[in-house]
Interface confidence: low
């Protein structure tokens, strides 16, 4: 889960102490320790309920079981023949909420859960075995998604039990490899600590040159794959058919970051459309120190010095539905 370890500035080693090698072996344990401490497995739960009063009206509730800071929630439902899906709502803790028909009302229930009501009339209304998916993007856990639908024999007014098992997606494909690396790192950390147990350590003291020492931030090992570093995209599922989770959103990741000034940790000035929706106050998505974004080939929420941007070369696909879904 999220940790923000203050890394004290190292004083130059005194003669006769460990020298440059001591520098490295002391910094590495700090980093590895942070990685080990942040290890954890968040979960997403989804609950789908058919309203007794309106048989084709659904309420979807989703929650994130993790201690990270949620930066985006995307709720989607399926498209025909597995050809794609439709985003129903996108909820951003600071920018507000957007929803598309047949979504009637999307809202934050708590700082880590949302609910969405779908209207039950018209061609775009859901059917009983529609699969709904919720995707939570958080720091440091990354992107987590779960899907749910009504059980086949659901009575109106009853709800499907929450489904907390997150679905493994392509953006989590590197999970095992990274976990293995981090496991090795943790073992190595213990080895280092044992090696240094009887050695004198250089003095540590806070930096006098900056008001705040740099923060070491790390991704949870279960989320540290390259693709998991992407800012999340909407999820795709089939409607009234078995769910398919192999189709990515036609675009690729969230957008308002593009207008954020460098180092900005606040919402840029803009229309008051967001102010009408009660939303929980939350922090910014990720600090500018997190250079991991550069590896992911995606634009970070806001960029810091020395961080290279790689705009998505794919661009959009031809679009015919809400959010451009075929």
């Amino acid at each position: 889960m999220r940790t923000e370890a203050q890394v004290p500035a190292l004083q130059p080693p005194e003669p006769g102490l460990e020298g440059a090698m001591g520098h490295r072996t002391l910094v590495l344990p700090w980093v590895l320790l942070t990685l080990c401490v942040t290890a954890g497995t968040p979960e997403v739960w989804v609950q789908v309920r058919m309203e007794a009063t309106e048989l084709s009206s659904f309420t979807i509730r989703c929650g994130f079981l993790g201690s990270g800071s949620i930066s985006l929630v995307t709720v989607s439902w399926g498209g025909p023949n597995g050809a794609g899906g439709t985003t129903l709502a996108v909820l951003h803790p600071e920018r507000g909420i957007r929803q598309w028909a047949p979504a009637r009302q999307a809202r934050w229930e708590t700082q880590s859960s949302i609910s969405l009501i779908l209207e039950g009339s018209g061609a775009s209304s859901p059917c009983a075995n529609t699969t709904f998916c919720c995707k939570f993007a958080s720091f440091p856990e990354g992107s987590w998604e779960a899907c749910g639908s009504l059980p086949p024999s659901s009575d109106p007014g009853l709800s499907a039990p929450p489904t907390p098992a997150p679905i493994l997606r392509a953006d989590l494909a590197g999970i095992l490899g990274v976990s293995g690396v981090l496991l090795f790192g943790c073992v190595y950390l213990l080895h280092l600590l044992r090696r240094h147990k009887h050695r004198p350590a250089p003095r540590l003291q806070p930096s006098r040159t900056s008001p705040q020492a740099p923060r070491a931030r790390a991704w949870a090992p279960s989320q540290a794959s390259q693709a998991a570093l992407h800012v999340p995209y909407a999820t795709i599922n089939t409607s009234c058919r078995p769910a398919t989770l192999d189709t990515a959103h036609p675009h690729g990741g969230p957008s308002w970051w593009a207008s954020l000034p460098t180092h900005a940790a606040h919402r840029p000035q803009g229309p008051a459309a967001w102010a009408s929706t009660p939303i929980p106050a939350r922090g910014s998505f990720v600090s500018v120190e997190n250079g991991l974004y550069a590896q992911a080939g995606e634009r970070p929420p806001h960029t810091g010095p020395g961080l290279t941007l790689f705009p998505d070369p794919r661009g959009p696909r031809a679009m015919e539905g809400p959010l451009g879904v075929r």
Partner: antibody, heavy 129, light 107 residues
Framework: QVQLQESGPGLVKPSQTLSLTCTVS??????????WSWIRQHPGKGLEWIGY???????SYNPSLKSRVTISVDTSKNQFSLKLSSVTAADTAVYYC?????????????????????WGQGTTVTVSS | EIVMTQSPATLSVSPGERATLSCRAS??????LAWYQQKPGQAPRLLIY???TRATGIPDRFSGSGSGTEFTLTISSLQSEDFAVYYC?????????FGQGTKVEIK
């Protein structure tokens, strides 16, 4: 301040290809974040969306015109272009280029501001022999 | 595609009066609706987006409301410069579709 300027022949013969160019000034097409759209307006009629392009070259067209439309982009010139083939008198219209804010394709999620906020002044194209 | 229908086709209003324009979508577009103003010989100008949010520089006498399939543009007190044609446009689905327009003329 981003400005758009359409250019191209005002008269096209039937069955030929209509070609228009929109030059973007005050901003870069390559910066991403916008659709660059073409819209037309028949004399005394309403507006019809033709299609859009993104700086990467990705396009989407109105199904009613899809078989005849090609939109392309030249980022080095900061321009995007419209080609409409096999024109008839029914294609006589004022053609506008516009910037559509609705989605930011660079990263893919909806923006929190929508609609075509910047338009060219329009260019009249007459299809006649 | 979603068909947008505006009414009335023409609205005659005296300066200083209130004007109410309607737009109906053939299917729900949630709140994804924009309004444009067009004067003769000029390009359309974005007034309202996302159903009720005024675009930059648009005076507060313009307001939008509605959701789903029924939308309204209200001009609280018509000024001389407000006499024009107004179009609604849905931005919920592709292709983008516009209404046929409502002409607001001086009574």
């Amino acid at each position: 301040q981003v400005q758009l300027q359409e250019s191209g022949p005002g008269l096209v013969k039937p069955s030929q290809t209509l070609s228009l160019t929109c030059t973007v000034s005050g901003g870069s097409i390559s910066s991403g974040g916008y659709y660059w759209s073409w819209i037309r307006q028949h004399p005394g009629k309403g507006l019809e969306w033709i299609g859009y392009i993104y700086y990467s070259g990705s396009t989407s067209y109105n199904p009613s015109l899809k078989s005849r439309v090609t939109i392309s982009v030249d980022t080095s010139k900061n321009q995007f272009s419209l080609k409409l083939s096999s024109v008839t008198a029914a294609d006589t219209a004022v053609y506008y280029c516009a910037r559509d804010l609705d989605y930011d394709i660079l990263t893919g999620y909806p923006r929190w501001d929508y609609g075509m906020d910047v338009w060219g002044q329009g260019t009249t194209v007459t299809v006649s022999s | 595609e979603i068909v947008m229908t505006q009414s009335p086709a023409t609205l005659s209003v005296s300066p200083g009066e209130r004007a109410t324009l309607s737009c109906r979508a053939s299917q729900s577009v949630s709140n994804n609706l924009a309004w444009y103003q067009q004067k003769p010989g000029q390009a359309p100008r974005l007034l309202i987006y996302s159903e009720s949010t005024r675009a930059t520089g648009i005076p507060d006498r313009f307001s939008g409301s509605g959701s789903g399939t029924e939308f309204t543009l209200t001009i609280s007190s018509l000024q001389s410069e407000d006499f024009a044609v107004y179009y609604c446009q849905q931005h919920n689905n592709w292709p983008r579709t516009f209404g046929q327009g409502t002409k607001v003329e001086i009574k």
